[in-house]
């Protein structure tokens, strides 16, 4: 029987900068029941606080609701593991909520084949930002990435769309059914999951771009 091993806070995520959750990995338990507590203070403060919610994020997590979440302030947090034989502390983790946003996938993905008379045909892809993200305030810049592939192909073709919410693709295989998905990330932050796939049938007379 031993004191617990050193835990590690390995991930923090926020869906929208209004709330966030951090997760830790326990160290070895030393063969004894072990209690974990997360304590934190904000940059410039000395007063320590305990995690406000150990439940919402699941096991080995701490959830910070709206009233506990401040943008532009660094949180300095650590996890304490304690059993009958002693305690161990994780390294301190410095967290700025602005940098840990992982948004929901983009919405309303629409895909259409356009065949203008005077120009080459193209695939037109359009989408909307996730609803939880408020782009109007200027706090967020969302970047988008599109991936597509013929239904039976193994490899995805990836296009970076920057900040735009529509995109044109010229080079496609005629007669193929394509899957199209889009995802987004804040300028600092994490990629969302891919949106649900939208399928589009490319007409047989679609002219391949040179």
């Amino acid at each position: 029987q031993l004191p617990p091993g050193k835990p590690e806070i390995f991930k923090c995520r926020s869906p929208n900068k209004e709330t966030f959750t951090c997760w830790w990995r326990p160290g070895t338990d030393g063969g004894l029941p072990t209690n974990y507590s997360l304590t934190y203070h904000r940059e410039g403060e000395t007063l320590m606080h305990e995690c406000p919610d150990y439940i919402t994020g699941g096991p080995n997590s701490c959830h910070f609701g709206k009233q506990y979440t401040s943008m532009w302030r660094t949180y300095i947090m650590m996890v304490n593991a304690t059993n009958q034989m002693g305690s161990s502390f994780s390294d301190e983790l410095y967290v700025d909520v602005t940098y840990i946003v992982q948004p929901d996938p983009p919405l309303e993905l629409a895909v259409e084949v356009k065949q203008p008379e005077d120009r080459k045909p193209y695939l037109w892809i359009k989408w909307s930002p996730p609803t939880l993200i408020d782009l109007k305030t200027g706090w967020f810049t969302l970047l988008y990435e599109i991936r597509l592939k013929p239904e039976k192909a193994a490899e995805w073709e990836i296009h970076f769309a920057g900040q735009q919410t529509e995109f044109k693709i010229l080079s496609l295989h005629p007669g193929q059914k394509y899957l199209v998905q889009v995802r987004c990330k804040p300028d600092h932050g994490y990629w969302s999951a891919w949106s649900p796939a939208t399928f589009i049938q490319i007409p047989s007379d679609f002219t391949m771009n040179d």
């Epitope: 991930k11 410095y94 967290v95 700025d96 602005t98 940098y99 990629w191």
Partner: antibody
Framework: EVQLVQSGAEVKKPGSSVKVSCKAS????????MHWVRQAPGQGLEWIGE????????NYNQKFKDRATLTVDKSTSTAYMELSSLRSEDTAVYYC?????????????WGQGTLVTVSS | EIVMTQSPATLSVSPGERATLSCKAS??????VAWYQQKPGQAPRLLIY???NRYTGIPARFSGSGSGTEFTLTISSLQSEDFAVYYC?????????FGGGTKVEIK
């Protein structure tokens, strides 16, 4: 204990490439951005770029955009910086540096440095 | 890019005295400034982040202040191990940039 251990010194010819490695231990590699900074002999520090090991998303100093390539190998917790078309002015100590937290780009842990000498 | 200008280039101070190092940004950077110490043959060591916050384990004799474009690192009472080169760094906008350094030497 957090450690960043870099590969050994290199001597390269002008026009060639160099690839410096940085093996991380003591923390979850994918949690923190990794940065690369260089220091020419007797000079100050110059930021080359940064990479997020969780998804290999990277940002570069425009000065190095066309010549530097940052990559990671998650299976070995190793970051790499490749610099191509080397010239004598690229002679410097190259450092990897871990982001201080999940936040802005200040650097709390540094590798020991790798001296790259470019000479004909 | 934002240019960080440090002064003086060299500062000669006696042990136990106070050292004040200056760093000026060419554009507004808020408090997005860090300070590092570097000794010969070693990698830099983080001292201060967010202009005024001491990093874990850094002695209280090191303090940072300033916001906007003017920043100061103060070492209240220089110890023998503090003689080194000090760099400021801004992380307000890409590319992240460092000052040219201030060498603190024994008077």
């Amino acid at each position: 204990e957090v450690q960043l251990v870099q590969s050994g010194a290199e001597v390269k010819k002008p026009g060639s490439s160099v690839k410096v490695s940085c093996k991380a231990s003591g923390y979850t590699f994918t949690t923190y951005w990794m940065h690369w900074v260089r220091q020419a002999p007797g000079q100050g520090l110059e930021w080359i770029g940064e990479i997020d090991p969780s998804d290999s998303y990277s940002n570069y100093n425009q000065k190095f955009k066309d010549r530097a390539t940052l990559t990671v190998d998650k299976s070995t917790s190793t970051a790499y910086m490749e610099l191509s078309s080397l010239r004598s002015e690229d002679t410097a100590v190259y450092y990897c540096a871990r982001n201080g937290g999940l936040g802005p780009a200040w650097f709390s842990y540094w590798g020991q440095g790798t001296l790259v000498t470019v000479s004909s | 890019e934002i240019v960080m200008t440090q002064s003086p280039a060299t500062l000669s101070v006696s042990p136990g005295e106070r050292a004040t190092l200056s760093c000026k940004a060419s554009q507004y950077v808020g408090t997005a400034v860090a300070w590092y110490q570097q000794k010969p043959g070693q990698a830099p060591r983080l001292l201060i982040y967010s202009a005024s916050n001491r990093y874990t384990g850094i002695p209280a004799r090191f303090s940072g202040s300033g916001s906007g474009t003017e920043f100061t690192l103060t070492i209240s009472s220089l110890q023998s191990e503090d003689f080194a080169v000090y760099y400021c760094q801004q992380y307000s906008s890409y590319p992240w940039t460092f000052g040219g350094g201030t060498k603190v030497e024994i008077k």
